[in-house]
């Protein structure tokens, strides 16, 4: 339905508060280095303009597309060339090329200072002094650091952020009330950002069909009682929402997401019995709740899949005449029966089924050729099952920190060219799979673990894409979305790698390590571990363990010393020498 003024349409649909918040998010995700005040000024100008269009849709420029309006506004930033360099060239382009150009310049790892959390009293004062600015600043800081954060979901986070301050700044012990809530929001926010980044990568690198296949599998697991036609409709709508958000069309995305939540709640009887509570909540909570809702119970007495997908005489005809529908139905039927499988495994099975039909249907006896296709699934199912079993055993044996270290060593040996901060970040996140998923019963382990690993490996892929250094990473990241994890799992030690020159400076530590939080201290130690492996990729587990134990003892000793700095200097030299000897450097 065409509207005379798109900006007026979205302003009316979303309301002023959400409109302003979403425009701020959009601008901060595009111009990640711009100061907060500059963005607020731009947002206010766009909002005033939108109001004129609401008053008169025929007013000048009100008929322009949102990309044109927003792009024109971004291109008025005076410091564009000196701050962003070649991104300024985008402004010489016409829409839609200009927006595509802005999208290509989004930076997954912007050079921004770490967000330091002020004292609770300072935060509460700032919150009370100007609540609106305080919350806008939250949106701005998150959006610029996470340029693909799912915008309507960020509104939900901001609502919870506000609620935390509203409640806790009145509490007797403000810190005890507020800090756990902020920690939870931070951790959930990072997870949400990473999950959305995978959705955008799926759409942008592998196309709409890849995303739709993922959505069919996931929604079929979640809504196994829904008919295929219903799931297909939800998939189409969900794909539109995520395509818009990943494309920077945040107003349309938020509007369409609200419409989708409304539709789901109006039709919950034919979708899922688990939606009742979600649908009683306000909009932002409702949408979040639907996105996280537990899987509905599987219908009783589902027939065998073989009848329609192996035994039927029409298998090849149905496949050839409408692959998308037939393979979509296969994926739907398989997924609704297997909430115990990861989405990526289901997609591998569907791909194997498709490949088999493509190979067999033109053969003299197609049925004989594909009759055993389900037998081909067995090794595909067993591979992640075995991997998860082994790694959960290792996790239970080592605990999270040492499990992360095992993964750090494993991945540094596989892809030693990758930067140390990226290896540390990715391996730490890979290691979190243990505490996140190994506690689950068998039936929930695989969907938890393998789909989480897909999200984490995508972080590696997007960070590596910015500055590619390893052909092996590029290959695993680009060849197949669903086979990324098996591809990385299959990598052995990179025998072509020339070990890094030893640099004592890398292993020189100072007293400041003593004041760090436990997490930051772990990161320091893990950074040293990666560097050790880069210097000595052939080092054994035992050698690395001995060096790391010595290192931990050294830090502990010097942090207890009276003259910490002298201890770090003198004992540090001894440690470096001992480590070199132990590793034969």
């Amino acid at each position: 339905d065409a509207h005379k003024s798109e900006v007026a349409h979205r302003f009316k649909d979303l309301g002023e508060e959400n409109f302003k918040a979403l425009v701020l998010i959009a601008f901060a995700q595009y111009l990640q280095q711009c100061p907060f005040e500059d963005h607020v000024k731009l947002v206010n100008e766009v909002t005033e303009f939108a109001k004129t269009c609401v008053a008169d849709e025929s007013a000048e420029n009100c008929d322009k597309s949102l990309h044109t309006l927003f792009g024109d506004k971004l291109c008025t930033v005076a410091t564009l060339r000196e701050t962003y360099g070649e991104m300024a060239d985008c402004c010489a382009k016409q829409e839609p090329e200009r927006n595509e150009c802005f999208l290509q310049h989004k930076d997954d790892n912007p050079n921004l200072p770490r967000l330091v959390r002020p004292e609770v009293d300072v935060m509460c004062t700032a919150f009370h002094d100007n609540e609106e600015t305080f919350l806008k600043k939250y949106l701005y800081e998150i959006a610029r650091r996470h340029p693909y954060f799912y915008a309507p979901e960020l509104l939900f986070f901001a609502k919870r952020y506000k609620a935390a301050f509203t409640e806790c700044c009145q509490a007797a012990d403000k810190a005890a009330c507020l800090l756990p809530k902020l920690d939870e929001l931070r951790d959930e926010g990072k997870a949400s950002s990473a999950k959305q980044r995978l959705k955008c990568a799926s759409l942008q690198k592998f196309g709409e069909r890849a995303f739709k296949a993922w959505a069919v599998a996931r929604l079929s697991q979640r809504f196994p009682k829904a008919e295929f036609a219903e799931v297909s409709k939800l998939v189409t709508d969900l794909t539109k929402v995520h395509t818009e958000c990943c494309h920077g069309d945040l107003l349309e995305c938020a509007d369409d997401r609200a419409d989708l939540a409304k539709y789901i709640c109006e039709n919950q009887d034919s979708i899922s019995s688990k939606l009742k509570e979600c649908c009683e909540k306000p909009l932002l909570e409702k949408s979040h709740c639907i996105a996280e809702v537990e899987n509905d119970e599987m219908p009783a007495d589902l027939p065998s899949l073989a009848a329609d997908f192996v035994e039927s005489k029409d298998v090849c005809k149905n496949y050839a005449e409408a692959k998308d529908v037939f393979l979509g139905m296969f994926l739907y039927e398989y997924a609704r029966r297997h909430p115990d499988y990861s989405v990526v495994l289901l997609l591998r099975l569907a791909k194997t089924y498709e490949t088999t039909l493509e190979k067999c249907c033109a053969a003299a006896d197609p049925h004989e050729c594909y009759a055993k296709v389900f037998d081909e699934f067995k090794p595909l199912v067993e591979e992640p099952q075995n991997l998860i079993k082994q790694n959960c055993e290792l996790f239970e044996q080592l605990g999270e920190y040492k499990f992360q270290n095992a993964l750090l060593v494993r991945y540094t040996k596989k892809v030693p060219q990758v930067s140390t901060p990226t290896l540390v970040e990715v391996s730490r996140n890979l290691g979190k799979v243990g505490s996140k998923c190994c506690k689950h019963p068998e039936a929930k382990r695989m969907p938890c673990a393998e789909d989480y690993l897909s999200v984490v490996l995508n972080q590696l892929c997007v960070l590596h894409e910015k500055t590619p250094v390893s052909d092996r990473v590029t290959k695993c990241c680009t060849e197949s979305l669903v086979n990324r994890r098996p591809c990385f799992s299959a990598l052995e030690v990179d025998e072509t790698y020339v070990p890094k020159e030893f640099n004592a400076e890398t292993f020189t530590f100072h007293a400041d390590i003593c004041t760090l939080s436990e997490k930051e201290r772990q990161i320091k130690k893990q950074t040293a571990l990666v560097e050790l492996v880069k210097h000595k990729p052939k080092a054994t587990k035992e050698q690395l363990k001995a060096v790391m134990d010595d290192f931990a003892a050294f830090v502990e000793k010097c942090c207890k010393a009276d003259d910490k700095e002298t201890c770090f200097a003198e004992e540090g030299k001894k440690l470096v020498a001992a480590s070199q000897a132990a590793l034969g450097l």
Epitope: G207, E208, R209, C316, Y319, A320, E321, A322, K323, D324, V325, E354, L357, E358, K359, C360, C361, A362, A363, A364, D365, P366
Partner: antibody
Framework: EVQLLESGGGLVQPGGSLRLSCAVS????????INWVRQAPGKCLEWIGI?????TTFYATWAKGRFTISRDSTTVYLQMNSLRAEDTAVYYC???????????????WGQGTLVTVSS | DIVMTQSPSSVSASVGDRVTITCQSS???????LSWYQQKPGKAPKLLIY???KLTSGVPSRFKGSGSGTDFTLTISSLQPEDFATYYC???????????FGCGTKVEIK
């Protein structure tokens, strides 16, 4: 040597019918899918349809109804009815690469036979 | 409707030149079902590349296919005298009935 050899082309009046043949030698036809593709003078290639080894046929949307593909042990046929001037073209038969059923990968082609529809 | 657009429709080049031909499909092809053919006057087409980037056996490595989804490219890295011909892309879709070819790019001697 594997060969595909078309025959049966010629001049036909508008509204008339024609049956083209594609004789296959050097391979066992019962294991392969064969396509018909045409090319009007100086124009694009146009896929007409396919017959799988099992005898199942599929046609381009525009070709359904007027064109029929069939086969016997060594020959594939293209029956063309209600011919029009715009059907004037060189008609080729071509084998689909083994291991594919619906992909446009044709590794062996005949030399083509010209069909002219004119009064 | 399926639309497969090849560009340019013709290109003049010299021996040793690098030649790039593009093929745009709407909608996207199914599962990288994209082929490239070479056709010389009075002859049948010859399959060069399948699955967007795989070289048919016997085809020289100067021919390279790339792309996915809707946008595909055939590159001849160093044009040889025998490469002057017309090149067609072919696409496969969700329905076999939609199998379509582009209208060709003629590579001529400059």
């Amino acid at each position: 040597e594997v060969q595909l050899l078309e025959s049966g082309g010629g001049l036909v009046q508008p509204g008339g019918s024609l049956r083209l043949s594609c004789a296959v030698s050097g391979i066992d036809l019962s294991n392969y899918a064969i396509n018909w593709v045409r090319q009007a003078p100086g124009k694009c290639l146009e896929w007409i349809g396919i017959i799988w080894a099992s005898g199942t046929t599929f046609y381009a949307t525009w070709a359904k109804g007027r064109f029929t593909i069939s086969r016997d042990s060594t020959t594939v046929y293209l029956q063309m009815n209600s011919l029009r001037a715009e059907d004037t073209a060189v008609y080729y038969c071509a084998r689909t690469v083994p291991g594919y059923s619906t992909a446009p990968y044709f590794d062996l082609w005949g030399q083509g036979t010209l069909v002219t529809v004119s009064s | 409707d399926i639309v497969m657009t090849q560009s340019p429709s013709s290109v003049s080049a010299s021996v040793g030149d690098r030649v790039t031909i593009t093929c745009q499909s709407s909608p996207s092809v199914w599962s990288n079902f994209l082929s490239w053919y070479q056709q010389k006057p009075g002859k049948a087409p010859k399959l060069l590349i399948y699955e967007a980037s795989k070289l048919t056996s016997g085809v020289p490595s100067r021919f390279k296919g790339s792309g996915s989804g809707t946008d595909f490219t055939l590159t001849i890295s160093s044009l040889q005298p025998e490469d002057f011909a017309t090149y067609y892309c072919g696409g496969g879709y969700s329905s076999i009935s939609d199998t379509t070819f582009g209208c060709g790019t003629k590579v001529e001697i400059k």
